[in-house]
């Protein structure tokens, strides 16, 4: 039951984790205007990773999308690359974590499919967790650069009398939210993890012993890994005929009581 | 069609307040931010602040800050603006006028202006 | 606060003749996010409210005769009537739209000869 709730809860929380990539992703507001300190415009900027914007006073928007490949900084790439990858990798995680709960009965899947199943969306979770902190990260420490560059020439004489303030730019909402996200996924990757384990328990190698008691020799028949829903025997869903065992193959798995929540 | 109409001229005495108001119609009121500027006699254009109607946010021009009130009515599309401690140098047309949409914060119909004369 | 400054004071043209008044900021009035020009020109006619002409330095308001014509970036601007006409007569003002508090220059008033 523990174990059902645990993945039950890894997989929420991944899913949170990974909408909110998405929209980290999507928004326009990865570096804002900084208005601290900063003379007071008329117009508010904001850029995300596919455009920039202008709002003006009035309220009225204008987006233009970064239409060149070339032109754009490597870093930008970097981020944009890191964030796609989280992405991808986590809808696979949710579509694989999905076949893997133990709430959901799919034909004949075995536990021990549903434990390797698990595990491998808890890594993949994991990564994609991973990919967004880390793309969030080193937008935010590009922001930083550049923000203490622009400080220091935060006036540009053009000649003269005049000069030219330059926009300096501060954390957006996006990287916030792409922290928290990538974070909710890589805890619900962690506890995808913890899940499997409690899914495939350590066992003996050896399934089955047959005895012989009028003979000297001991016939071990093993057995491949086996997952079960709990830490006890598992032999509750095994046909056992005379006392013999049967090898992994062969066992017919039928749900329990357990296996609905 | 848009209208900004402004209230009669007024006299008033150093030291005292003036209120003018600004009656919208046309428009949707609330949506658009409207601006106070005045115009001393063969002097140019000042800008004293703007409020918008939709929530009552205000932005004041530092020079009038403390003398300066920006309130609107939106049951009547009204926007007033009182001045207080009112100086000689105060004498001038004032126009509130309304912020265009997507017109580079730029004004875009204008009030026929209210005549306040600062005399002792 | 921004200081906009507009030349000639004055000028007195023949009809049909061309005229440019210019505007100088004293910082740039360009939003490097959108690349557009923060500054807008305004006609004022003698007893009249302004009038909007130009919004972002080039952008003519709808209903203004095409004859106007405003350029310029950055810090320094231009309006131009290629064809002076008799109801041209007014001053022009050109207001700094970017910054706060917004400021207008001392305007340019336009005669016929």
């Known amino acids: 039951m523990a174990v059902t709730a645990c993945q039950g809860l890894g997989f929420v929380v991944s899913l949170i984790g990974i909408a909110g990539i998405i929209a980290a992703t999507c928004m326009d507001q990865w570096s804002t205007q900084d208005l601290y300190n900063n003379p007071v415009t008329a117009v508010f900027n904001y850029q995300g990773l596919w455009r920039s914007c202008v709002r003006e006073s009035s309220g009225f928007t204008e987006c233009r999308g970064y239409f060149t490949l070339l032109g754009l900084p490597a870093m930008l790439q970097a981020v944009r690359a890191l964030m796609i990858v989280g992405i991808v990798l986590g809808a696979i995680g949710l579509l694989v974590s999905i076949f893997a709960l133990k709430c959901i009965r799919i034909g004949s899947m075995e536990d021990s499919a549903k434990a390797n199943m698990t595990l491998t969306s808890g890594i993949m979770f994991i990564v994609s967790g991973l990919c967004a902190i880390a793309g969030v990260s080193v937008f935010a420490n590009m922001l930083v650069t550049n923000f203490w560059m622009s400080t220091a020439n935060m006036y540009t004489g053009m000649g003269g009398m005049v000069q030219t303030v330059q926009t300096r730019y501060t954390f957006g909402a996006a990287l916030f939210v792409g922290w928290v996200a990538g974070g909710l996924t890589l805890i619900g990757g962690v506890m995808m993890c913890i899940a499997c384990r409690g899914l495939a328990p350590e066992e003996t190698n050896y399934k089955a012993v047959s005895y012989h008691a009028s003979g000297h020799s001991v016939a071990y028949k093993p057995g491949g890994f086996k997952a079960s829903t709990g830490f006890g025997s598992n032999t509750k869903n095994k046909k056992i005929y005379d006392g013999g065992a049967r090898t992994e193959d062969e066992v017919q798995s039928y749900p329990s009581k357990h296996d609905y929540v | 069609q848009v209208q900004l109409v402004q209230s009669g001229a007024e006299v008033k005495k150093p030291g005292a307040s003036v209120k003018v108001s600004c009656k919208a119609s046309g428009y949707i009121f609330t949506n658009y931010w409207i601006h106070w500027v005045r115009q001393a006699p063969g002097q140019g254009l000042e800008w004293m602040g703007r409020i918008y109607p939709g929530t009552g946010n205000t932005y004041y021009n530092e020079k009038f800050t403390g003398r300066v009130t920006m309130t609107r009515d939106t049951s009547t599309s009204t926007v007033y603006m009182e001045l207080s401690s009112l100086r000689s140098e105060d004498t001038a047309v004032y126009y509130c006028?309304?912020?265009?949409?997507?017109?580079?914060?730029?004004?875009?119909?204008w009030g026929q202006g209210t005549t306040v004369t600062v005399s002792s | 606060d921004i200081v906009m400054t507009q030349s000639p004071d004055s000028l007195a043209v023949s009809l049909g003749e061309r005229v440019t008044m210019n505007c100088k900021s004293s910082q740039s009035l360009l939003n490097a996010g959108n690349q557009k020009n923060y500054l807008t020109w305004y006609q004022q006619k003698p007893g009249q409210p302004p009038k909007l002409l130009f919004y972002?330095?080039?952008t003519r308001e709808s209903g203004v005769p095409d004859r106007f014509s405003g350029s310029g970036s950055g810090t320094d601007f231009t309006l131009t009537i290629s064809s002076v006409q008799a109801e041209d007569v007014a001053v022009y003002h050109c207001?700094?739209?970017?910054?706060?508090?917004?400021?207008f220059g001392g305007g340019t008033k336009l005669e016929i000869k």
């Open positions: 006028a309304r912020e265009g949409y997507g017109k580079g914060n730029s004004m875009d119909y």
């Open positions: 207001q700094n739209a970017y910054y706060y508090p917004y400021t």
């Open positions: 972002w330095a080039s």
